[in-house]
């Protein structure tokens, strides 16, 4: 049986059940290389507390549909009066990066995972030439996830003192110059994740090969190498390579750009101080507030919730958007869709789409940006579920009793962007990270 998601095959992926102190290793096409789980384990459960391993999915006993992968085992599970076997079930959803498998829950018999990934999309619009896993777990099983830094088009310009060259990078994947043909990037060779521009010429100085690595508690490293044979004439016979070290800052701060810290014979060392290198619990919340020792800040957007069936309305040319954030009140236009953001076509109000659901909510504060994300909306033709990204700005004089109002700023590939000036986005900082 052919592998259903070949892009995901090259790596063993990790997922974590933090509540039970369990690390899962997943290889969806072959087997994980862990002796204790046996030679054919596709999903290996490592119980860190008891230091034991259990295979909860066998690569030989795989069954697949377009959006579901199941690995059975021959191990019977303890459900009275049945002869069920332990199994793992991975539900795939379309995403804009390779993404990460997320542990959802487990019963006596089944371990459930969900994976939003380009590999599950109906169309290839989000697929990279080359992309590598972009997250790691530290020794405390906390997730460090750089997926939000991945650019789907364009690139980051590295801060470099050399006026004659410009180094552009992407994170964990190659630079897509077709979707955003900026004049400087247009000449970059396909597949490059590090592109050196000199005058009118552009050179591939690195492609992603291995996934993100954790080198110390708050330092993550990505290594790019030039795969192509044939040396560049300005590299003194060396093969180009790029090392990007992502550093979690010691306290809350605004974002910085990547900086070139060393350069020798086409070996480029880049340091990027960014809160995205910190563990995810430091940056994110599933509720509308971020507070406590762990996050170093106090943010509470819950006063923005609307009651009594009313919604915020944002004009989007062809569409009206109805928003009800930080609550579970149904938007009347989007009846029974559990939508936090509802898109209604002006010319045909029967055309209604959920652009993100209130159960699928993430509040993120990173590098000085406060963002509320609603995902899991109605599918677009690509298979991608509509989502909304609301970027908040602190405004102590916002109207509407300080609440302000969301403003639609645009749409890219079924992701809807809004800005929202409000006094409730004014962040209070603590200092003890």
């Amino acid at each position: 049986q052919a592998a259903p998601f070949p892009e995901l095959c090259s790596y063993t992926w990790e997922a974590v059940d933090t509540k039970n102190n369990v690390l899962y290793k997943i290889n969806i096409c072959g087997s994980v290389d862990i002796v204790q789980c046996g030679p054919s384990s596709a999903v290996c459960m490592h119980d860190l507390k008891t230091r034991t391993y259990h295979s909860v999915g066998d690569s030989v006993l795989r069954s697949a549909t377009r959006s579901l992968l199941e690995f059975n085992t021959t191990v019977s599970c303890d459900q009275q009066g049945t002869n069920h076997r332990v199994q793992s079930s991975i539900a795939f959803l379309c995403g804009k990066t390779l993404g990460t498998p997320e542990f959802v829950t487990a019963t006596e018999c089944v371990h459930y995972f969900e994976w939003r990934t380009t590999a599950a999309c109906k169309k290839d619009i989000f697929k990279a030439n080359k992309e590598v896993p972009c997250y790691v777990f530290d020794e405390e099983l906390r997730k460090h996830d750089l997926n939000p830094l991945i650019k789907l088009s364009g690139a980051y310009l590295v801060d470099d003192s050399d006026p004659d060259t410009s180094l552009f990078i992407n994170v964990c994947r190659d630079i897509d110059t077709l979707r955003d043909p900026g004049s400087q990037l247009r000449a970059c060779p396909p597949g490059t994740a590090a592109c050196l521009v000199r005058g009118h010429q552009a050179f591939d100085v690195g492609q992603p090969r291995d996934g993100l690595k954790l080198v110390r508690k708050d330092r993550l490293v990505l290594s790019y190498v030039r795969e192509e044979a044939g040396k560049l004439d300005f590299c003194d016979g060396h093969s180009p390579a790029v090392t990007i070290t992502f550093v979690c800052p010691s306290e809350r701060r605004e974002g910085t750009i990547p900086k070139l810290t060393a350069k020798s014979n086409c070996r480029y060392e880049i340091e990027w101080i960014t809160e995205y290198a910190c563990h995810r619990d430091y940056l994110e919340s599933k509720t509308c507030s971020l507070s406590g020792e762990q996050q170093d800040v106090s943010i509470d957007l819950t006063p923005l919730a609307q009651s009594g069936g009313s919604s915020y309305i944002s004009d989007g040319k062809e569409y009206l958007f109805y928003l009800n954030v930080c609550g579970e009140t149904e938007i009347q236009f989007c009846n029974k869709k559990q939508a936090a953001v509802c898109q209604v076509k002006k010319s045909d109000t029967s055309q209604v789409k959920a652009a993100g659901r209130y159960h699928n909510q993430t509040l993120r504060y990173s590098d000085g940006d406060l963002t509320l994300i609603y995902f899991g909306g109605d599918e677009c033709s690509s298979g991608f579920q509509r989502m909304s990204v609301i970027n908040f700005e602190c405004n102590k004089t916002a109207g509407n009793d300080g609440k302000g109002t969301p403003v639609f700023t645009g749409e890219v590939d079924c992701t809807y962007f809004f800005t929202w000036d409000t006094e409730y986005a004014c962040v209070h900082h603590h200092h003890h990270h």
Epitope: N20, D78, A106, T107, E108, H111
Partner: nanobody, 111 residues
Framework: QVQLQESGGGLVQPGGSLRLSCAAS????????MDWYRQAPGKQREWVAT???????TYADSVKDRFTISRDNAKNTVNLYMNSLQPEDTAVYYC?????WGQGTQVTVSS
């Protein structure tokens, strides 16, 4: 304040059965992972069985197919059913949740 209290230990003949219980105050078992450990005289404490918060169960090889761990949410207890007991099962049995431990209950298997 969290307290765990084991009960049900005793003297049993080889091949016999026992049911150990762990009662809790200050913690809700259904939200937490529970483990049973045991310590035989002169030996290190060893893991016996796990009941995760979601319901999956795992057992040490030495007790697999003989011991069963289960939860009674109404009574907020976790039980360890022990069948086909052997002399090598003689030990003090402890229940554990995170950093919290019970005082232990003695199980002796002897004819």
């Amino acid at each position: 304040q969290v307290q765990l209290q084991e009960s049900g230990g005793g003297l049993v003949q080889p091949g016999g059965s026992l049911r150990l219980s762990c009662a809790a105050s200050g913690i809700i078992f259904s939200d937490n992972r529970m483990d049973w450990y045991r310590q035989a005289p002169g030996k290190q404490r060893e893991w016996v069985a796990t009941l995760a918060s979601y319901g999956w169960k795992t057992y040490a090889d030495s007790v697999k197919d003989r011991f069963t761990i289960s939860r009674d949410n109404a009574k907020n207890t976790v039980n360890l059913y022990m069948n086909s007991l052997q002399p090598e099962d003689t030990a003090v049995y402890y229940c554990n949740s995170g950093q919290y431990w019970g005082q232990g209950t003695q199980v002796t298997v002897s004819s």
